[in-house]
């Protein structure tokens, strides 16, 4: 049993290392924001015994503007993304080679196949190690990831800013 991607939190981001039951993850506030005292960034994948469905607990996190960090660039505003549009994020490598989803090229890689679910941002669902990722979409509700549909995906070993509504199957800048 695994959890779907966690809910989005305003002005915060998350990179999930594991979607497994009882896994604990932390949100982090965007640049220019800080965690409000008394709120918690922790979320845990727990099982609802009544429905036998796993879900992430709701963090009490509130990210507020941090006047001490005004020199850091604040998070760019989110943009609505449309499922079905081929994502075009920045390129890190000019390589045009396509990876083989079935065989990660090295032992420190994890591969997942993304299946787009219409209606939202692309968000996969699963934990480290090779697997198939089913991605659902969900419009970004805040200043976390956003410029491109693919930008918010989180992969096998990590998931970030993933909104609710993703269906776990095989989970997964320039200065």
């Amino acid at each position: 049993i695994t959890c779907p991607p966690p809910m989005s939190v305003e002005h915060a981001d998350i990179w999930v290392k594991s979607y497994s039951l009882y896994s604990r993850e932390r949100y982090i506030c965007n640049s220019g924001f800080k965690r409000k005292a008394g709120t918690s960034s922790l979320t845990e994948c727990v099982l609802n015994k009544a429905t036998n469905v796993a879900h992430w607990t709701t963090p009490s996190l509130k990210c507020i503007r941090d006047p001490a960090l005004v020199h850091q660039r604040p998070a760019p505003p989110s943009t609505v993304t449309t499922a079905g549009v081929t994502p075009q994020p920045e390129s890190l490598s000019p390589s045009g080679k396509e990876p083989a989803a079935s065989s990660p090229s090295s032992n420190n890689t994890a591969a997942t196949t993304a299946a787009i679910v219409p209606g939202s941002q692309l968000m996969p669902s699963k934990s480290p190690s090779t697997g198939t990722t089913e991605i659902s979409s969900h419009e970004s509700s805040h200043g976390t990831p956003s410029q491109t549909t693919a930008k918010n995906w989180e992969l096998t070993a990590s998931a970030s800013h993933q909104p609710p509504g993703v269906y776990p199957q095989g989970h997964s800048d320039t200065t």
Epitope: D13, W15, N30, S31, Q72, R73, A75, P76, T86, P87, Q88, P89, E90, S91, L92, S93, S95, G96, K97, E98, P99, A101, P104, S105, S106, N108, T109, A110, A111, T112, T113, A114, A115, I116, L122, P124, P128, T133, I135, G143, T144, P145, S146, Q147, T148, A150, K151, N152, W153, E154, L155, T156, A157, S158, S160, H161, S172, D173, T174
Partner: nanobody
Framework: EVQLVESGGGLVQAGGSARLSCAAS????????TAWFRQTPGEQREVVAI???????SYADFVKGRFTISRDNAQDSVYLQMNGLKPEDTAIYYC????????????????WGQGTQVTVSS
Amino acid sequence: EVQLVESGGGLVQAGGSARLSCAASGIPGTLNDTAWFRQTPGEQREVVAIRRSGGNISYADFVKGRFTISRDNAQDSVYLQMNGLKPEDTAIYYCAIAVFSRDFPPKRYEYWGQGTQVTVSS
């Protein structure tokens, strides 16, 4: 073969600085997100900073104002500038990047480096 190689770790005096580099090679497709994590003995790996492909950046509370994540597309590298280091920053630091293939639907991949040890002495 995909490789992520971290460097820049070592022994640093408290209050000092270090710049970690993560050089990527053989990455297929285009970059999505990058992040730095750290892990101390007996503890879970924790996120330090995340940089999304669109430029959005987030930092963990414990490094805010001290660490800066950046990227150099031309060099296929990701960096973590660490200033005002404290003994509690001692850990193995890992970089992670996520890419997606150009086909449709895209395939999502994540790659992790092997880590570089940073030791901050008081």
